[in-house]
Every structure is written in structure tokens, then in C-alpha cells.
């Protein structure tokens, strides 16, 4: 009678994460008697996956009915495969012995490779906002994929970017891998509505890449332009001065009127209008009682935008043509901001 052989017909098996792996094994004889065991890896550190004789292996089921008296099929299924299950699996026949069973013959082994999808790419931008013409960095990370081969691309508004660096870790063999990429993007004034997209393609995604996005509205700061103008006299002794704050982003803005360097009124931008490019415009006005002034008045519109140092624009108001009222040193009448916008 020929000696028992343990046959593992599959050198390798490729399984998607979450699926069930089937590892095939047959013996050519029932003799010598003794149990079959499955191990991952070889040598003293090998991991027991299934023991016919005893134990509880909740993820493992046998392909055939091992309670059949003539059974020689010891194939197993392992459910809910993860990248951590990758490795070489050995079907090993033991010969009964006392006190312990003795390893009799091993199959040649089946290498289980696990295909795992990358996680959704997460794109993150700089911690602080930056202004147009500056270069900012965006990072993209995706984890848990296998095999290692992966493609990452960057886009800004559908246009592919070329200035980026990508690393896949670890460099050596691993159950799963991570990708990290940093792209450099030059900001323009029109980028409030722009998007940066990181696109990851992997064999497990069947041609349908994963995308992560970042809105440049979270990154950009467009500083305002200021224009102070004097309007025609509304009534005798009154002048209307407007400060037009144009093309700013984000909305957070505080405006202060100064008369000859003294604070006259402070207000916060509330009812703004939005431009097509996503930036905002706002206008504030000041009604000045010129008869209250002996000398010319320097009116300054000072704007603090998004916590940045204030910018200002001044306007000299000539008052010499008007009769001066004695004993008056208050120059302005505080009013609400004009809700009309001037383009």
C-alpha cells in the first residue's frame, strides 16, 4: 500500500477582503490514523488555524463532511478575510501517538493573498489661510490596501497637477499598505470656488477610483480692495462719504471709520453681496456734518479682514467753503451702513 500523501492543489489563492477563502487539501489514504490540522506559516511559530480533533474555530468551516467515515477531503473555508490573514497555509496530517500526536506529513502549502480596498482618501490643507499667488500644500492619505501597487493623481478643478510627492509604506512586505502624498498648489484670486481632488486607483476598485476633495474656500484668503468716495451733498452742511470694500473672502470683516485719527464708528460686515467668483462686496457710509468743523477733515476707512492687520484708505474732506459753527468739536453723525452696493 502506498504511503499517504497530503495534496494541496493550489499554490496560491487570491481573495478580496471580506470574502471567504477556500483552501483545498486531500489525503490519499485514511491510514495512518490521526487528525488533520491546518497552520498558517511553518516552524515553531506557526499559527493553528483548524484542528480536526478539538477546539473552536468560529471563522473556519470544512468544505466536506468530516464525519463521513471515508472522508479524505480536508479542505477548509475561512470567512471574512482581512489583510492580516495573508500568508502560507499548510494542511498537516498527524499520526496518533501517546501522549501527543506526531506530525506525519505536510502539504506543500497554499499562499493566501488578500486584495483589500484602500480607504477613502482624506485630503487636508494648510492650518492657516493663504493669499493669492502663494503656494500651499495639500496632503492626501489612504490606508489598508493590498497589494501594494496603487496610483494617485491630483487635480485642481479637473486639471491634473504635476507638483506632488507620493510615498507608499511600508517599503517591504506587509499585510496592507498606506499611501501619503503632498501636492503644491498656487492660489489665484478666483479660487474661492475651486476644489483640489486626490484620486486613488487600485486593482480592487475595478476601474472606479476613490476621490477625496478639499475646497479651496477653506484655504484661501482674498484681501479686500478699498475705495473711499465723497457723494454729492445730501443737504446743506452734510456730506455722504462711502467706503466700498470689494472682492474679499472670507466674509469675516470689521470696518472702522476714523475722523482725524479718532474712532467714529465700528461695524461688522453683515449684509454683503456675493460676486460670481465667490468673493464678497460691502459698502459702508458716513454722513458728515461739515458745519461742525473749523478745519479740513481726514476721513479714514480702516478694515480688519479675517483677523489680519488692518488696511485703510483715507479721504480728505474740504470744509473751508462752509461757515464754521463756534464751539463744536464733534464732526460726524453716526448712521447705519448703506445697504446699496456700488460696483
Amino acid at each position: 500500500e502506498e504511503e499517504l500523501q497530503v495534496i494541496q492543489p493550489d499554490k496560491s489563492v487570491l481573495v478580496a477582503a471580506g470574502e471567504t477563502a477556500t483552501l483545498r487539501c486531500t489525503a490519499t489514504s485514511l491510514i495512518p490514523v490521526g487528525p488533520i490540522q491546518w497552520f498558517r506559516g511553518a516552524g515553531p511559530g506557526r499559527e493553528l488555524i483548524y484542528n480536526q480533533k478539538e477546539g473552536h474555530f468560529p471563522r473556519v468551516t470544512t468544505v466536506s463532511d468530516l464525519t463521513k467515515r471515508n472522508n479524505m477531503d480536508f479542505s477548509i473555508r475561512i470567512g471574512n478575510i482581512t489583510p492580516a490573514d495573508a500568508g502560507t497555509y499548510y494542511c498537516v496530517k498527524f499520526r496518533k501517538g501517546s501522549p501527543d500526536d506526531v506530525e506525519f506529513k505536510s502539504g506543500a502549502g497554499t499562499e493566501l493573498s488578500v486584495r483589500a480596498k484602500p480607504s477613502a482618501p482624506v485630503v487636508s490643507g494648510p492650518a492657516a489661510r493663504a493669499t493669492p499667488q502663494h503656494t500651499v500644500s495639500f496632503t492626501c492619505e489612504s490606508h489598508g490596501f493590498s497589494p501594494r501597487d496603487i496610483t494617485l493623481k491630483w487635480f485642481k478643478n479637473g486639471n491634473e497637477l504635476s507638483d506632488f510627492q507620493t510615498n507608499v509604506d511600508p517599503v517591504g512586505e506587509s499585510v496592507s499598505y498606506s499611501i501619503h502624498s503632498t501636492a503644491k498648489v498656487v492660489l489665484t484670486r478666483e479660487d474661492v470656488h475651486s476644489q483640489v481632488i486626490c484620486e486613488v486607483a487600485h486593482v480592487t476598485l475595478q476601474g472606479d477610483p476613490l476621490r477625496g476633495t478639499a475646497n479651496l474656500s477653506e484655504t484661501i484668503r482674498v484681501p479686500p480692495t478699498l475705495e473711499v468716495t465723497q457723494q454729492p451733498v445730501r443737504a446743506e452742511n452734510q456730506v455722504n462719504v462711502t467706503c466700498q470694500v470689494r472682492k474679499f473672502y472670507p466674509q469675516r470683516l470689521q470696518l472702522t471709520w476714523l475722523e482725524n485719527g479718532n474712532v467714529s464708528r465700528t461695524e461688522t460686515a453683515s449684509t454683503v453681496t456675493e460676486n460670481k467668483d465667490g468673493t464678497y462686496n460691502w459698502m459702508s457710509w458716513l454722513l458728515v456734518n461739515v458745519s461742525a468743523h473749523r478745519d479740513d477733515v481726514k476721513l479714514t476707512c480702516q478694515v480688519e479682514h479675517d483677523g489680519q492687520p488692518a488696511v485703510s484708505k483715507s479721504h480728505d474732506l474740504k470744509v473751508s467753503a462752509h461757515p464754521k459753527e463756534q464751539g463744536s468739536n464733534t464732526a460726524a453723525e453716526n448712521t447705519g451702513s448703506n445697504e446699496r452696493n456700488i460696483y
Epitope: 485514511l30 491510514i31 495512518p32 490514523v33 487528525p35 480536526q52 480533533k53 478539538e54 463532511d65 468530516l66 464525519t67 463521513k68 467515515r69 471515508n70 496518533k96 501517546s98 501522549p99
Partner: antibody, heavy 117, light 106 residues
Framework: DVQLVESGGGVVRPGESLRLSCAAS????????MSWVRQAPGKGLEWVAG???????YYSGSMKGRFTISRDNSKNTLYLQMNSLTAEDTAVYYC???????????WGLGTLVTVSS | ALTQPASVSANPGETVKITCSGG?????YGWHQQKSPGSAPVTVI????QRPPDIPSRFSGSASGSTTTLTITGVRAEDEAVYYC???????????FGAGTTLTVL
């Protein structure tokens, strides 16, 4: 706890039939092979038949043809259909759970079958 | 067929060995205790040397080739029973039993 309870025994005449049942509880019946073992009065144990979890059947040579072992996994019940009974079939019939290598680890209390004219 | 002695006796506390021969390398063995005729057998050893969880540790089993041995270390009065060796033969797919050994505790 593993429990095996046989039923269906009784007195029959030679040539008649009888169907024994064994109700199982306390373990995964559908995953285990099962057997019938009998013991004639004043005699030793004698294996009658076995059945795998999926229903493959095995018989002692002397009982092949007359006896049929079967199971209903949905009811956790093992059966033994006995036909053409003779006086030599008089015995206590036990059902037993098989181990991975077809030995027995748990037994029922038995049911007595008497074949007498 | 498996062959075992018809009877053995021992004093309480002694070690008793019951042997059973007639098997082969293709056999696995078990031992079953029956305290009275017609009562349910209780398995004390299966798979040559495995003890079910509710069986006292004084019961042990061993096997070598065609022979299996049941050892009761420190026998007690309640161990008095008939002990059947049983075997499963992988070459014939059949179970067999010995005729039984009556253990008397003196």
C-alpha cells in the same frame, strides 16, 4: 448538557417492524455523526449502524439490509427503522454521539425492544 | 474482535489496569463503563487517552498498536462496573466492542 432520549421500543412479533427515535439536545446535532448500539440481555455491546452529519450511512454486516438509520437535522432526531425482526434482535437499543474519530462519548438511556411470538 | 479479561478485582486505593487487544494501527480506542445491565453506558475514555470533562482524573487510557489499556489509579467502590473497550477501525469503517470486563472492588 448533552442529552439523548430514545423512544419507540416495545414488544413485537417476529417478522414485524419497529421504528426507534432518539431526541438529541445540548449540542449541535447537525454537526455530529451518530450511531445506534444494542445490548442483548446478559450480553455485551454491539454496534448496529452509524450515520454522518450529512446522512451517509454505515451498517454492521449482520444488520445490513434489514435496518435503516436516518436523521432529521431540523428536528434534532435520529431514527432506526427495523424490519423483519427476529428474536435475536431483542435488546436495549442505545443511541450514541460519535467523536471526530467515530468513537462514542455520550449515550442515551436506551429503549427496550422485545421480539417474541 | 477485541479481547479483554472477563474480570479483574482490586482493593480500594489500588491501581487497576484492564487491557484490550485485537486491534491494529488503524484503530482508535475507547472505554465505556456500565454499572448495571441495561443501564446507560458512560464513556470514561475516548480517542485512546481522552477523558470526557465529567470523568474523574483517576481514569486514564493509553494505546500502542493492537492494544489499549484502561488504568484506574486509586480505585474506589463506586468504580465497580463492567468496562467495555471499544474500537473504530479506519480500514473497515466499523465499530467493535470487547465482551466486557467486570471490575470488583473488594
Amino acid at each position: 448538557d448533552v442529552q439523548l432520549v430514545e423512544s419507540g421500543g416495545g414488544v413485537v412479533r417476529p417478522g414485524e417492524s419497529l421504528r426507534l427515535s432518539c431526541a438529541a439536545s445540548g449540542f449541535s446535532f447537525s454537526s455530529n455523526a451518530m450511531s445506534w448500539v444494542r445490548q442483548a440481555p446478559g450480553k455485551g455491546l454491539e454496534w448496529v449502524a452509524g450515520i454522518s452529519a450529512s446522512g451517509d450511512t454505515y451498517y454492521s454486516g449482520s444488520m445490513k439490509g434489514r435496518f435503516t438509520i436516518s436523521r432529521d437535522n431540523s428536528k434534532n432526531t435520529l431514527y432506526l427503522q427495523m424490519n423483519s425482526l427476529t428474536a435475536e434482535d431483542t435488546a436495549v437499543y442505545y443511541c450514541a454521539r460519535e467523536t471526530w474519530n467515530h468513537l462514542f462519548d455520550y449515550w442515551g438511556l436506551g429503549t427496550l425492544v422485545t421480539v417474541s411470538s | 474482535a477485541l479481547t479483554q479479561p472477563a474480570s479483574v478485582s482490586a482493593n480500594p486505593g489500588e491501581t487497576v489496569k484492564i487491557t484490550c487487544s485485537g486491534g491494529s494501527d488503524s484503530y482508535y480506542y475507547g472505554w465505556h463503563q456500565q454499572k448495571s445491565p441495561g443501564s446507560a453506558p458512560v464513556t470514561v475514555i475516548y480517542s485512546d487517552d481522552q477523558r470526557p470533562p465529567d470523568i474523574p482524573s483517576r481514569f486514564s487510557g493509553s494505546a500502542s498498536g493492537s492494544t489499549t489499556t484502561l488504568t484506574i489509579t486509586g480505585v474506589r467502590a463506586e468504580d465497580e462496573a463492567v468496562y467495555y473497550c471499544g474500537g473504530y477501525d479506519y480500514s473497515t469503517y466499523t465499530n467493535t466492542f470487547g465482551a466486557g470486563t467486570t471490575l470488583t472492588v473488594l
